[in-house]
């Protein structure tokens, strides 16, 4: 015997209270597949979330984050505050990267400048809060009289972090 509920299309539910008749999903609910015995409540995009796609009877609402925040998690389930490049997010807000560290993203944390000398190279361009140093040729490769800039970059061996 075929389940009568299997005939209920997406956007409806099989209403046990009405002799298993297919009833439309109530307002603010949806069913994305057929044969459902209940409709799911639509996601509401509130607070730092904003609506990217409205809920319909057959599909859930989709949210993204308001400007100044970025999405984390499946389906943008979380919003985290942006900072500027050259900063990192702490509980007290966005803080500038400490000297010798940088962050080239609006999210995430600062990390140390590359230590060019670990690869036997010299610093071609100094690092900033927003950008890593640029390493150039090894000092021995430089022509006589050429000089290289060597800022006091912190070591960047694996596992080392600035304190």
């Amino acid at each position: 015997l075929q389940d009568p509920c299997s005939n209920c299309p997406a956007g409806t539910f099989c209403d046990n209270n009405r002799n298993q008749i297919c009833s439309p999903c109530p307002p603010n609910s949806f069913s994305s597949a057929g044969g459902q015995r209940t409709c799911d409540i639509c996601r509401q995009c509130k607070g730092v979330f904003r609506t990217r796609k409205e809920c319909s009877s057959t599909s859930n609402a989709e949210c993204d984050c308001t400007p100044g925040f970025h999405c984390l998690g499946a389906g943008c389930s979380m919003c985290e505050q942006d900072c500027k490049q050259g900063q990192e997010l702490t509980k007290k807000g966005c803080k500038d990267c400490c000297f010798g560290t940088f962050n080239d993203q609006k999210r995430g944390i600062c990390r140390p400048w590359t230590n060019c000398s670990l690869d036997g190279k010299s610093v071609l361009v100094n690092g900033t809060k927003e950008r890593d140093v640029v390493c150039g040729p090894s000092p021995a490769d430089l022509s006589p009289g050429a000089s290289s800039v060597t800022p006091p970059a912190p070591a960047r061996e694996p596992g080392h972090s600035p304190q």
């Epitope: 984390l72 998690g73 499946a74 389930s77 979380m78 985290e80 702490t90 509980k91 993203q105 995430g108 944390i109 990390r111 140390p112 590359t114 890593d132 960047r156 694996p158 596992g159 972090s161 304190q163």
Partner: antibody, heavy 116, light 108 residues
Framework: QVQLVQSGAEVKKPGESLKISCKGS????????ISWVRQMPGKGLEWMGK????????NYSPSFQGQVTISADKSISTAYLQWSSLKASDTAMYYC?????????WGQGTLVTVSS | DIELTQPPSVSVAPGQTARISCSGD??????AHWYQQKPGQAPVVVIY???NRPSGIPERFSGSNSGNTATLTISGTQAEDEADYYC???????????FGGGTKLTVL
């Protein structure tokens, strides 16, 4: 959609080496930290360390510093966790997770069994 | 590094309120996050940045964090909430993440 897919279960002998992997897809792999988390049988979660695949900068928990090596190949969106000489006490489930503070996506886990 | 201490187990009757504590020196100065892990599954965020609930997580989950204690509260606990719960924090001293030891929540 974002996915982290880990390599399959491993059975090894003490003293052997091992490298397990975590392949990311559906996002800009280079610009998000990847962390590794250990869970020994019946025990809790332990953060091991993290890597920024964009430039392979790593940072380890003091408990795991020198015990494992974390690396990444951004060209194939893959992070690695490796041991040069396994011990029986390395038997555990190992998870990779995206992030450094909030871990929003997790791999399915790689079970590593070390037994003679 | 900061050490986070959780009770190994908490039991609660269905419909009652469960509170899981996570204590650590000045944890209130850092964001606390909470993960739920069910057997054979990877952990899932249930609370992030002290008190924020990801979409898809029921409203009965809430969090707070101040002083030396972060707390996960589950109001009107349901059988499906039975799981292991872990707190975690990222510390800018040492640049490491730390997990609490975990709490097994049993719904009686």
């Amino acid at each position: 959609q974002v996915q982290l897919v880990q390599s399959g279960a491993e059975v090894k002998k003490p003293g052997e080496s091992l490298k397990i992997s975590c392949k990311g897809s559906g996002y800009s792999f280079s610009t998000y930290w990847i962390s590794w988390v250990r869970q020994m049988p019946g025990k809790g979660l332990e953060w091991m360390g993290k890597i920024y695949p964009g430039d392979s900068y790593t940072n380890y928990s003091p408990s795991f510093q020198g015990q494992v090596t974390i690396s990444a190949d951004k060209s194939i969106s893959t992070a690695y966790l490796q041991w040069s000489s396994l011990k029986a006490s390395d038997t555990a489930m190992y998870y990779c997770a995206r992030g450094y503070g909030i871990f929003d996506y997790w791999g399915q886990g790689t079970l590593v069994t070390v037994s003679s | 590094d900061i050490e986070l201490t959780q009770p190994p187990s908490v039991s609660v009757a269905p419909g009652q309120t469960a509170r899981i504590s996570c204590s650590g020196d000045n944890i209130g100065d850092q964001y606390a996050h909470w993960y739920q892990q069910k057997p054979g599954q990877a952990p899932v965020v249930v609370i992030y940045q002290d008190k924020n609930r990801p979409s898809g997580i029921p409203e009965r989950f809430s969090g707070s964090n101040s002083g030396n204690t972060a707390t996960l509260t589950i109001s009107g606990t349901q059988a499906e909430d039975e799981a292991d719960y872990y707190c975690s924090t990222y510390t800018f001293v040492g640049f490491t993440t730390v997990f609490g030891g975990g709490t097994k929540l049993t719904v009686l």
